[in-house]
């Protein structure tokens, strides 16, 4: 089909790219991300030192095939998928008629993606159409994070397996920028 | 700054080999793709394939397979294009050029384009 | 392999003019396709990719546009600095093939 991708096996096509976090969604200090600088780790926040055992944020394994139209991956590809509550683990009762029922007090924490990777996939599609070579965003890790005001609860769904094309008028990102210069796009992204 | 820098011209016999290094500096080497893209006298440009220096995989175009061996030194953020069985139809100018993706938050997959370059490695293929 | 043509192969224009380049894919490659500048002996320069978003620090003059198989490339007002050769990248299926490339020179 025009092209091999291979290491020691020469079957091999979906070869994996290294992990990088996605860019966090505020930078107190201001400091760019600049994966040269600080190794592609945001900083911690203050609010995630506490103690892990505080937490229940689950990386689930996820096996599926990534399609893009009629176009299927040749292989499926595995990612996480986040779930789970997170804590600091504080409960408060609530009445609710006869029962009880717990909600965590306190900031509002969500297990989300924390590490991504991108990953080649071929895509095997019908019709004597040519394979289809793409890279796929894949979660990597997951993590308790503090949702502020600016964060979007959209993003928070899993991700699709069907292509999402950039939306008119609104620019795909490149996947490390200075934060100071985009700090109004973070706002609204992981 | 970001910048892919090669290694020197090189002259080489028919039937030889011959090496081209594009070493990395002011990212971190291994996490972008490296395409690399000939281009002869007076000609368009030419993809020959892809390597990603974190896992060492690679993808080549099937006119130059067999002939073309892509490696990577990550102790020295440098990349490798070694093709050999050289013809005269191989004289060309060799680029480097690291391979950006860009994504829509929420969007399944990224868009490609070779957003730095090294400057060109001139190999003439001559008896 | 996907074959890449574009046309014209050369354009000779004035400071000022609008410039139109066209660059037609052999098969559908959706918006996977990037646009790069090429003066004579300097590197290419990424102008534009998934067929339509500019690269950070290209002026806002360069814009693409297109799906599928056909795609331009449009210059609205040529500056000096413009004078180059111009190819089209499809990046849909290995190999990521190019076109030969349109020159723009002075009129």
């Known amino acids: 089909q025009g092209w091999q991708a291979f290491k020691n096996d020469a079957t091999e096509i979906i070869p994996e790219l290294g992990e990088y976090p996605e860019p966090p969604p505020e930078l107190e200090n201001n400091k760019t991300m600049n994966r040269a600088e600080n190794g592609g780790r945001p900083p911690h926040h203050p609010f995630e030192t506490k103690d892990v055992s505080e937490y229940s944020c689950r990386e689930l394994h996820f096996t599926r095939y990534v399609t893009d139209g009629p176009c299927r991956s040749a292989k499926p590809v595995t990612e996480l998928v986040c779930s789970g509550q997170c804590g600091p683990a504080r409960l408060l009762p609530n009445a609710i008629g006869r029962g009880k029922w717990w909600r965590p007090s306190g900031p509002d924490f969500r297990c989300i993606p924390d590490r991504y990777r991108a990953q080649r996939v071929q895509l095997l599609c019908p019709g004597g159409e040519a394979p289809r070579a793409r890279k796929v965003r894949l979660v990597a890790s997951c993590k308790c994070k503090r949702l502020t005001r600016f964060h979007n609860q959209s993003e928070l769904k899993d991700f699709g397996t069907e292509a999402a094309r950039p939306q008119k008028g609104r620019k795909p990102r490149p996947r490390a920028r200075s934060a100071k210069a985009n700090q109004a796009e973070l706002e609204n992204a992981y | 700054q970001v910048q892919l820098v090669q290694s020197g011209a090189e002259v080489k016999k028919p039937g030889a080999s011959v090496k081209v290094s594009c070493k990395a500096s002011g990212y971190t080497f291994t996490s972008y793709d490296i395409n690399w893209v000939r281009q002869a006298t007076g000609q368009g440009l030419e993809w020959m394939g892809w390597?990603?220096?974190?896992?060492?995989?690679?993808g080549y175009a099937q006119k130059f397979q067999g002939r073309v061996t892509m490696t990577r030194d990550t102790s020295i953020s440098t990349a490798y294009m070694e093709l050999s069985s050289l013809r005269s139809e191989d004289t060309a100018v060799y680029y480097c050029?690291?391979?950006?993706?860009?994504?829509?938050?929420?969007?399944?997959?990224?868009?490609?384009?070779?957003?730095?370059w090294g400057q060109g490695t001139t190999v003439t293929v001559s008896s | 392999d996907i074959q890449m043509t574009q046309s014209p192969s050369s354009v000779s224009a004035s400071v000022g003019d609008r410039v139109t380049i066209t660059c037609r894919a052999s098969q559908d490659i959706s918006n996977w396709l990037a646009w790069y500048q090429q003066k004579p002996g300097k590197v290419p320069k990424l102008l534009i990719y998934a067929a339509s978003y500019l690269q950070s620090g290209v002026p806002s003059r360069f814009s693409g546009s297109g799906s599928g198989t056909d795609f331009t490339l449009t210059i609205s007002s040529l500056q000096p600095e413009d004078f180059a050769t111009y190819s089209c990248?499809?990046?849909?299926?290995?190999?990521?093939?190019f076109g030969p490339g349109t020159k723009v020179d002075i009129k």
């Open positions: 990248q499809q990046a849909n299926s290995f190999p990521f093939t």
């Open positions: 050029a690291r391979e950006e993706e860009y994504y829509e938050s929420g969007s399944l997959f990224y868009y490609y384009g070779l957003d730095v």
């Open positions: 390597m990603n220096p974190n896992s060492g995989k690679t």
